[in-house]
């Protein structure tokens, strides 16, 4: 069974551009989480969804960040406009 699938694996963009990250959770999982990890700030929970509904987005108070989960098998995290300090590893995770 395939695990959580994210795309793209790598993204390089110019400051001010829009970035969209995509995630396909494990089939049957009803919770989805977006995290950000940097050396300076560690691992931060940005937002999580339960049954496609955003439950807590307090990890992304900047309105440059937005996340959607239109159906049980797909979610996006968008940054618009992007800033150099957004450089990080972004993780998507899912759970039952």
């Amino acid at each position: 069974d395939a695990g959580v699938i994210q795309s793209p694996r790598h993204e390089v963009t110019e400051m001010g551009q829009e970035v969209t990250l995509r995630c396909k959770p494990i089939s049957g999982h009803n919770s989805l989480f977006w995290y950000r990890q940097t050396m300076m700030r560690g691992l931060e929970l940005l937002i999580y969804f339960n049954n496609n509904v955003p439950i807590d987005d307090s990890g992304m108070p900047e309105d440059r960040f937005s996340a959607k989960m239109p159906n049980a098998s797909f979610s996006t995290l968008k940054i618009q406009p992007s800033e150099p300090r957004d450089s990080a590893v972004y993780f998507c995770a899912s759970s039952l």
């Epitope: 307090s58 990890g59 108070p61 440059r64 618009q80």
Partner: antibody, heavy 117, light 106 residues
Framework: EVQLVESGGGLVQPGGSLRLSCAAS????????MHWVRQAPGKGLEWVSY????????YYADTLKGRFTISRDNSKNTLYLQMNSLRAEDTAVYYC??????????WGQGTTVTVSS | DNQLTQSPSFLSASVGDRVTITCRAS?????IYWYQQKPGKAPKLLIY???NLAPGVPSRFSGSGSGNEYTLTISSLQPEDFATYYC?????????FGQGTKLEIK
């Protein structure tokens, strides 16, 4: 009914410390981001700090980094602001506010901090 | 930091007047948020995401704008509207406020 009640303000000497508290009720505190905002006498609003529900995401105003520390205890429904090395220019009313509608949708009544010798 | 500049800083108007307050950002923002504050009281959220009225806010208040310039309009001033108004941005931390616009009775 959402309620935010600040406490811990008072008179402190320059260089001193103070810890402000904000007791929250009427909503699920453990799911909400929280802000501190201050207002010096006769001046405008100044954003101080933000903390996410689980404390993993924290932001500070650039000028306050290193002196002020935001924290929360979700088991006590309480938000804190630890203020060290206080200066006269930190004299202000300090408000806690709940993050909602992408902004600050509920505010406390404020607690007054006076830094003076 | 993104600096927000409100104009005018002071505004004298009469009951029934239509008034507009402008908030200009030094860098483009996605949305602007507006608050009302009366003397000795905490601020109150008026408008979020540029144009959405917070619960309980009368429909005479409206917001608009994009990019670097946003406006708050009160279509017909009521006695209870005389207060100080602040804009704020959440596009990028630090979450700066405008310096405020004090609306006084003429």
């Amino acid at each position: 009914e959402v309620q935010l009640v600040e406490s811990g303000g008072g008179l402190v000497q320059p260089g001193g410390s103070l810890r402000l508290s904000c007791a929250a009720s009427g909503f699920t505190f453990s799911n909400q981001g929280m802000h501190w905002v201050r207002q010096a006498p006769g001046k405008g609003l100044e954003w101080v700090s933000y903390i996410s529900s689980g404390s993993s995401t924290i932001y500070y105003a650039d000028t306050l980094k290193g002196r002020f520390t935001i924290s929360r205890d979700n088991s006590k429904n309480t938000l804190y602001l630890q203020m060290n090395s206080l200066r006269a220019e930190d004299t202000a009313v300090y408000y806690c506010a709940r993050r909602g509608e992408g902004a600050m949708d509920y505010w406390g009544q404020g607690t007054t901090v006076t830094v003076s010798s | 930091d993104n600096q927000l500049t409100q104009s005018p800083s002071f505004l004298s108007a009469s009951v029934g007047d239509r008034v507009t307050i402008t908030c200009r950002a030094s860098s483009s923002v996605n949305y602007i948020y507006w608050y009302q504050q009366k003397p000795g009281k905490a601020p109150k959220l008026l408008i979020y995401y540029t144009s959405n009225l917070a619960p309980g806010v009368p429909s005479r208040f409206s917001g608009s704008g994009s990019g670097n310039e946003y406006t708050l309009t009160i279509s017909s001033l009521q006695p209870e509207d005389f207060a100080t108004y602040y804009c704020q941005q959440f596009t990028s931390s630090p979450f700066t406020f405008g310096q405020g616009t004090k609306l006084e009775i003429k």
